[in-house]
């Protein structure tokens, strides 16, 4: 179950209930602790997790990225920047994550948490941010072609698609968990 | 060694169907992909689909799919293609394969020469 | 569907010289580094024979005088020296996504 009001905050009316922030901290690292267990069960399978850095760079894909511009780090930050850019990233990364869905045996109620999460992570950062009109929403058509594409790759390249997918979408939480700490 | 044995020669009656067999030996059946692949008389090499033994996972040409079903006998590490409601179209040399998880064919069968004739 | 499109569609040539096969893809056929392509030797009432995959790399007991090589869309197949024994029919096949498809293949004869 995804972190929210949970029985214990309930049952416990002295407890403060949690501020938007730490809902959305608490959101980003149950969506980690996902992704950990999903890259478990890749790395288990294949020997995916071994490929050097240099061949999962020379990649096709045009997965979401932190860079200077976006404001997210520490030098240049830019809070308003910074949230646009993690909120039009997540929604990036949602093609990505449907493509997951097929693609774990023992962990495929873990890949549909991580999924159905990002989602509701993406809805607490739209009610954070204030200039909504600065974030593109992905083409659908585009998306659901990208999605078609992949689905078609050979298994070792959804093998290591896959494994890239997870990489970057942890690397991508991560950035966003440190800009978020700072807003 | 690695072999694929097939049956040389089928005739079968146009309307009708028939289940071709690819025997596999000398490799571990359920860690390679198994492909079909026709050939018509002084044509070209035409991909069916594949499956995955282990799983009974499929993968099929758009063309092929209300053609050929593929399945698997891990008991006899054995891979069929049952291909239905047959034309003369159908004639041709059906070829299996199996390749590694990049889909490179390394070994092949003889090739099941079907004729589809009344 | 990835179109592969070989050139020529017959050769000939003179023992002892260089055989150049052509194919062309519709669309990038690499990822991570790697070129899904192959390359099959088949001669008359025989299965197809893998002598190239991924580009470049020699099948297992193929000779030495047959080498791939290409990247993104284009890929070729040299042999050198030709030999008697290298009249067949040619064909690339990308293997990145379903449907694999092969080219149209080339007649190599000697010349």
């Known amino acids: 179950v995804p972190p929210g009001e949970d029985s214990k905050d309930v049952a416990a009316p002295h407890r403060q209930p949690l501020t938007s922030s730490e809902r959305i901290d608490k959101q980003i690292r149950y969506i980690l602790d996902g992704i950990s267990a999903l890259r478990k069960e890749t790395c288990n399978k294949s020997n995916m997790c071994e490929s050097s850095k240099e061949a999962l760079a020379e990649n096709n894909l045009n997965l979401p990225k932190m860079a200077e511009k976006d404001g997210c780090f520490q030098s240049g930050f830019n809070e308003e920047t910074c949230l646009v850019k993690i909120i039009t990233g997540l929604l990036e990364f949602e093609v990505y994550l449907e493509y997951l869905q097929n693609r774990f045996e023992s962990s495929e109620e873990q890949a549909r948490a991580v999924q159905m999460s990002t989602k509701v992570l993406i809805q607490f950062l739209q009610k954070k941010a204030k200039n909504l009109d600065a974030i593109t929403t992905p083409d659908p058509t585009t998306n659901a072609s990208l999605l078609t594409k992949l689905q078609a790759q050979n298994q070792w390249l959804q093998d290591m698609t896959t494994h890239l997918i997870l990489r970057s979408f942890k690397e991508f939480l991560q950035s966003s968990l440190r800009a978020l700490r700072q807003m | 060694q690695v072999q694929l044995q097939q049956p040389g020669a089928e005739l079968v009656k146009p309307g009708a169907s028939v289940k071709l067999s690819c025997k596999a030996s000398?490799?571990?059946?359920?860690?390679?992909?198994m492909h079909w692949v026709k050939q018509r008389p002084g044509q070209g090499l035409e991909w069916i689909g594949e499956i995955n033994p282990s799983n009974g996972r499929t993968n099929y040409n758009e063309r092929f799919k209300s053609k050929a079903t593929l399945t698997v006998d891990k008991s006899s590490s054995t891979a069929y293609i049952q291909l239905s409601s047959l034309t003369s179209d159908d004639s041709a040399v059906y070829y299996c394969s199996r390749s590694d998880t990049k889909a490179t064919c390394d070994y092949w069968g003889q090739g099941t020469t079907l004729t589809v004739s009344s | 569907d990835i179109v592969l499109t070989q050139s020529p569609a017959s050769l000939a040539v003179s023992l002892g010289q260089r055989a150049t096969i052509s194919c062309r893809a519709s669309e990038s056929v690499g990822n991570f580094g790697i070129s899904f392509v192959n390359w099959f030797q088949q001669k008359p009432g025989q299965p197809p024979k893998l002598l190239i995959y991924?580009?470049?790399n020699q099948g297992s007991g193929v000779p030495a005088r047959f080498s791939g090589s290409g990247s993104g869309t284009d890929f070729s197949l040299n042999i050198h020296p030709m030999e008697e024994d290298d009249t067949a029919m040619y064909f690339c096949q990308q293997s990145k996504e379903v449907p694999y498809t092969f080219g149209g293949g080339t007649k190599l004869e000697i010349k």
């Open positions: 000398g490799y571990i059946f359920t860690s390679y992909w």
């Open positions: 991924a580009a470049s």
